[in-house]
């Protein structure tokens, strides 16, 4: 029998005893003679065993055999067997059957030779092989009764040496992650999804994360596949912060010289065309009209003042048409028009006077008479003993259709140093002083000024049925905007359809929504889809030209002659243009400088534009005085200059 080192060591002591085995056999003969065939004393037994321990073990048991089976002379075979077995301490076997290889009989003792993995006197104790050097296992060691087993963590497999572990590459199985990307890891794997997606182990697919459920946005959130966008209340003067989640105020980046002159009277405040000032003169003493004032405008058409009575009686209206003074008058129901003098809508101050002389009306510009009109009677009308005259500034007190020749009464102009009927009445001055909206900008330039809190809109048509093609409807939107912005965010122009759907918009924005990048851009969009973007140095105080051209199969955006970058595929573009074409055949309003109260998500920008702007649409310059509606704070033909801050 070959024994392993451990067993050999265990056997070392008993093996030395085994050298006396011949003596053991002789001893068995002596025992039979001395104690089986006849009764032996303890001393005689001592002589047989030649040692005390075995004797001490044997003798009491010997006596027990006699008690049980009678004395030797009784010749009970059971007695002989009983005595013969007493020295063999392995009978019955005291060792644990499971853990013992063999039992060694010793003198009055025994030795259990244990199998591998067992220990203890009776070989009944399991040896924990794992307690020493993990049983030689590279990862997991499982102790078992009389044995042990190496195992591997999940994701590893046990090698042929039954001890080493090797990583399993789960990614070799294409089904491991389904649609997702599989990444092998030591003992594991990970199913990866693009940013904005999360892995569903159940479906084995990448599913969109709804970031809007996570309250990422301060105001409005729109979830999209793999992403989300935050929107801020542009009409409320807010835009996205650099973190693209929170909102911040839209603040001017270019300072405009907004100072007002308290001694001036702004004529363009009322878009309705109603007068900004109404004066009622009444005299007991017959009086003649004398109106004198300094005047400044870039506006080619509008009403400076009206003086007289009812629309069907006697009155005069001093206005501007094509930049020249025009006097409309009606005396006792008979109407006339006179126009003369230089072009005066050059934006510089000039003194204008209208004086009622004996039988004439004399109009002067800078003290030079430009019109002298013979009239029959006075403007003051005698009623119930009193002479009456109504005087309105910046508008007329009746319908435009009641004029001799209709005129657009709206006039973006400014008056100062006025004198009505040699009047010393401070009422107008006091009223103007208390109301800044009645005052003019101290300095103005050409253009239209959008203060960032209102819009104008027009009812324009963008489609036409070409006669040569029959009923084929062609359409085009050509916009040229000359802008000098004060802020980096705002709608320049937009087409709005039924139910306030923003069909098309051209706007300034300070971020790239898909790249989530802060950048000053002009965006051209159909509804909420950006078609093209172009960078613009919006805060450089310079005038920039934004050109937009849309027609079948084409959408271009240019800033200062440089073409913008398309943001959509050819197919997407065509789809958007088809949609636009269809919508243009319905009712469309052209919004300038802002939008109505649409949803912030319906278009890239909802904020009002702030700054100077002149617009050309399909080859025609838009006159804000001819708009269907204009916010009263927008100045239609004048713009404050950029404030040049000296360091």
């Amino acid at each position: 029998v070959l024994l392993r080192a451990r067993e050999a060591a265990q056997f070392l002591r008993p093996r030395q005893r085994r050298a006396y085995q011949v003596f053991e056999e002789a001893k068995q003969g002596h025992l039979e003679r001395e104690c089986v065939e006849e009764v032996c004393s303890k001393e005689e037994a001592r002589e047989v065993f030649e040692n005390d321990p075995e004797t001490d073990y044997f003798y009491p048991r010997y006596q027990e055999c006699m008690r049980k089976y009678g004395r030797p002379e009784d010749k009970n075979p059971n007695f002989a067997t009983c005595v013969k077995n007493l020295p063999d301490q392995c009978t019955p076997n005291p060792c644990d059957k499971k853990g013992t290889q063999l039992c060694q009989d010793l003198m009055g003792n025994f030795f259990c030779l244990c199998k591998d993995g067992w220990g203890g006197r009776l070989c009944d104790k399991d040896v924990n092989e794992c307690s020493q050097k993990n049983g030689g296992c590279s990862q997991v060691c499982h102790n078992k009764p009389g044995s042990f087993q190496c195992a591997c963590h999940s994701g590893f497999s046990l090698q042929s040496d039954n001890k080493s572990c090797q990583d399993i590459d789960e990614c070799t199985d294409s089904d491991t992650c389904g649609d997702a990307r599989c990444k092998n890891l030591p003992g594991s794997y990970s199913c990866l999804c693009d940013k904005g997606y999360t892995y569903s182990s159940k479906e084995k697919t990448c599913q969109d994360v709804d970031e809007c459920q996570q309250d990422r946005c301060e105001q409005t959130c729109v979830n999209s596949p793999g992403s989300y966008t935050c929107h801020c209340n542009g009409r409320g003067g807010l835009k996205l912060s650099p973190d693209m989640d929170t909102c911040e105020d839209i603040l001017p980046c270019v300072p405009f010289s907004m100072a007002k002159s308290v001694k001036s009277l702004y004529l363009g405040r009322m878009f309705s065309g109603t007068p900004v000032i109404r004066l009622r003169f009444k005299r007991l003493q017959p009086t003649r009209l004398l109106a004198e004032f300094d005047f400044r405008t870039f506006d080619p058409e509008g009403v400076l003042f009206f003086a007289g009575g009812r629309s069907d009686s006697t009155w005069i209206v001093l206005g501007l048409r094509a930049g020249r003074l025009e006097l409309q008058l009606r005396y006792n129901g008979v109407g006339r028009i006179t126009s003369s003098g230089p072009t005066i809508n050059h934006g510089m101050w000039q003194t204008i006077s209208v004086e009622e002389l004996d039988r004439n009306l004399v109009i002067k510009v800078n003290k030079d008479a430009v019109m002298k009109i013979a009239v029959a009677g006075g403007l003051f009308q005698l009623e119930r003993g009193l002479y009456h005259l109504n005087l309105t500034v910046g508008g007329i007190p009746f319908k435009e259709s009641d004029l001799v020749q209709p005129i657009n009464p709206r006039l973006d102009g400014c008056m100062r140093s006025w004198n009505w009927l040699n009047g010393e009445d401070s009422a107008i001055q006091e009223t103007v002083k208390a109301n800044t909206k009645m005052q003019c900008f101290s300095v103005t330039e050409r253009g239209s000024f959008f203060p960032g809190n209102g819009f104008a809109f027009y009812s324009l048509n963008y489609t036409r049925t070409s006669l040569d093609v029959g009923t084929e409807t062609t359409w085009e939107v050509e916009v040229v905007a000359r802008i000098r912005p004060a802020t980096d965010t705002g709608v320049l122009m937009a087409l709005v359809g039924d139910k306030d759907v923003v069909l098309l918009s051209v706007a300034l924005v300070d971020y790239h929504s898909t790249k989530k990048l802060k950048k000053q851009l002009v965006v051209l969009a159909v509804e909420n889809v950006a078609l093209a973007l172009m960078e613009i140095k919006v805060c450089d105080s310079q005038e920039h030209t934004v050109t937009v051209s849309l027609r079948d199969g084409e959408a271009t955006l240019e800033v200062d002659g440089t073409k913008g970058q398309s943001e959509v595929s050819t197919a997407q573009l065509q789809e958007r243009l088809d949609l636009l074409k269809t919508r243009l055949q319905g009712s469309v309003l052209t919004f300038v400088g802002g939008l109505p109260d649409v949803q912030v998500t319906s278009t890239p920008v909802t904020a009002f534009y702030r700054g100077c702007m002149t617009l050309e649409v399909n080859g025609k310059t838009l006159d804000l005085d001819t708009a269907s509606y204009k916010h009263s704070d927008i100045t239609s033909h004048s713009c404050p200059p950029v404030e040049h801050v000296t360091a």
Partner: antibody
Framework: QIQLVQSGPELKKPGETVKISCRAS????????MNWVKQAPGKGLKWMGW????????TYTEEFKGRFAFSLETSATTAYLQINDLKNEDTATYFC?????????WGQGTLITVSA | ETTVTQSPASLSVATGEKVTIRCITS??????MNWYQQKPGEPPKLLIS???TLRPGVPSRFSSSGYGTDFVFTIENTLSEDVADYYC?????????FGAGTKLELK
Amino acid sequence: QIQLVQSGPELKKPGETVKISCRASGYTFTNYGMNWVKQAPGKGLKWMGWINTNTGEPTYTEEFKGRFAFSLETSATTAYLQINDLKNEDTATYFCARDEGWFVYWGQGTLITVSA
Amino acid sequence: ETTVTQSPASLSVATGEKVTIRCITSTDIDDDMNWYQQKPGEPPKLLISEGNTLRPGVPSRFSSSGYGTDFVFTIENTLSEDVADYYCLQTDSVPLTFGAGTKLELK
């Protein structure tokens, strides 16, 4: 600034004549007519009439026709009210007021007391 | 001649109270009604001119309304400095006629 300055108070006997002055400054005198208003002690205001400062033509209300006369000295930008044959009921404060259909600018008033 | 009937002839109010004075004309005068304040020893002061127009420098607690024949003058939150006589004047036709006046006193 526009000012209307009237002459001082007068104590007169019934039957006498009094002439009150009203000097205008701060505006073109002939552009506005001049009104006269009477206020008896503890009583209300009564419009007496007016004078055209261009032509000098006076206009009187019915109650003040006869003994009352409005006049001008245009060069002195002054208007006058003369009351002849004074009566006790003429005791009052007399105001001049510039014509604007209504009255914005007033003189400080001249108290005429008629007492035997 | 257009006669003007003013009421009440006098009234007494506590500081902070509202005052209402009424003038009724015998003919339709549109909105050609004016309102004056007169303090003892002073000439009348125009507060509100035709068309219910508050004159420059007059506090906004004074207001008026009315058209045709019925006119109302109001003082909101009366102050002690408002103690005076108040008159209405119609300037629709000659002769110009005043109301008899209202004496305002403080309680």
